[in-house]
């Protein structure tokens, strides 16, 4: 399901409990979608040994996965509450080529990964109602992504499993840092 | 053995600095969240700050601009510098994990603990 | 976000029902800890997510809350659970001067 229980539209409150505001819906739909990645990486982690790896000992490759940095507003030090929802945005965004890549690559999870990837859009749209400056935001490109996601299907075994590993610990961080900086807002 | 070890505590003069250190050993500490947490003489528990799988970082309010957390991968080791010290920094600093690093803060690797002494 | 834990201190027998509570300044969903510090050691989470037993702690343990209050229970109190014990949110930690709730300290009756 792309959204967490109870948190489809067209759900009717109960009685007792208040309908979520746009912040908690967010919140509530960040922690569903890590708690999807936490079991895609069992399953990648159960297969290889890459989940004790140090990162450094990961870093070299190719793939252009979204990161926060200072610069974008959303730590602590600095931080920017416009500048920080434009960053997370665009991220997820970005993302969606890799995620798009993840499908398929489950044997036990497929359902998972298909969760996360349709949970990523419901956020993304939810972010986009919170967003004022939505000029800023930079759509990626189909035409490059559809090049990227057929040069990493090409890779071979071993590299797609550390593509697969890469992705869903960049994801889960991106998400993490997004999600400590919106519990700021 | 997986282990958290602070060093570097010690006496130091009020406006003065240190720097802790925390060594891990039996993993990897850039793929966790690393706090520090303090305690001083028959006091509570006191959180200090935090970096995070990403080198983000967090401090409690008090902290900020006196206090700063790194990390030196390659040594596998936590830092952190504390500047302009005073006699209410006595205390004893601990190091800890987060061993899930899901996205809510919790500890269950702590080091032994280090004594800073601020005196003059 | 402030902690605020309560009682400060209590005095419980052995096979006791201890209850000791966190209270939140604001929601924190179920991100609370608790953990146990005995006098010259390291603390030792005993639960996470309000209600989840870490590794290796008896289960007379047990956590409940959401939201803004919580409770830590020993159901029966043994020897060995004369400690401090301290909660801990896990929901923040911008803005805020301590994650930790002050203390409460269970003594021998």
């Known amino acids: 399901a792309p959204v967490p229980p109870g948190e489809d539209s067209k759900d009717v409150a109960a009685p007792h409990r208040q309908p979520l505001t746009s912040s908690e819906r967010i919140d509530k739909q960040i922690r569903y979608i890590l708690d999807g990645i936490s079991a895609l990486r069992k399953e990648t982690c159960n297969k290889s040994n890459m989940c004790e790896s140090s990162k450094e000992a990961l870093a070299e490759n190719n793939l252009n996965l979204p990161k926060m940095a200072e610069k974008d507003g959303c730590f602590q030090s600095g931080f920017n509450e416009e500048t920080c929802l434009v960053k997370i945005i665009t991220g997820l965004l970005e993302f969606e080529v890799y995620l798009e890549y993840l499908q398929n690559r489950f044997e036990s999870s497929e359902e998972q990964a298909r969760a996360v990837q349709m949970s990523t859009k419901v956020l993304i749209q939810f972010l986009q109602k919170k967003a004022k400056n939505l000029d800023a935001i930079t759509t990626p490109d189909p035409t490059t992504n559809a090049s990227l996601l057929t040069k990493l299907q090409a890779q071979n075994q071993w590299l797609q499993d550390m593509t697969t590993h890469l992705i869903l610990r960049s994801f889960k961080e991106f998400l993490q840092s997004s999600l400590r900086a919106l519990r700021q807002m | 053995e997986v282990q958290l070890v602070e060093s570097g505590g010690g006496l130091v003069q009020p406006g003065g600095s240190l720097r802790l250190s925390c060594a891990a050993s039996g993993f990897s500490l850039s793929n966790y969240y690393v706090t520090w947490v303090r305690q001083a003489p028959g006091k509570g528990l006191e959180w200090v700050g935090i970096?995070?799988?990403?080198?983000?970082?967090a401090y409690a309010t008090w902290a900020i601009g006196r206090f700063t957390i790194s990390r030196d991968n390659s040594k596998n080791t936590l830092y952190l510098q504390m500047n302009s010290l005073r006699a209410e920094d006595t205390a004893v600093y601990y190091c800890?994990?987060?061993?899930?690093?899901?996205?809510?803060?919790?500890?269950?690797?702590w080091g032994q603990g280090t004594l800073v002494t601020v005196s003059s | 976000i402030q902690m605020t834990q309560s009682p400060s201190s209590l005095s419980a027998s052995v096979g006791d029902r201890v209850t000791i509570t966190c209270q939140a300044s604001?929601?924190?969903?179920?991100?609370l800890s608790w953990y146990q510090q005995k006098p010259g050691k390291a603390p030792k989470l005993l639960i996470y997510r309000a209600s989840t037993l870490a590794s290796g702690v008896p289960s007379r343990f047990s956590g409940s809350g959401s939201g803004t209050d919580f409770t830590l229970t020993i159901s029966s109190l043994q020897p060995d659970d004369f400690a401090t014990y301290y909660c801990q949110q896990g929901y923040s930690l911008r803005n805020i001067d301590n994650a930790f709730g002050g203390g409460t300290k269970v003594e021998i009756k």
């Open positions: 604001q929601s924190i969903n179920n991100e």
């Open positions: 800890a994990r987060d061993d899930s690093s899901d996205w809510d803060a919790k500890f269950n690797l």
């Open positions: 970096i995070y799988g990403s080198d983000e970082t």
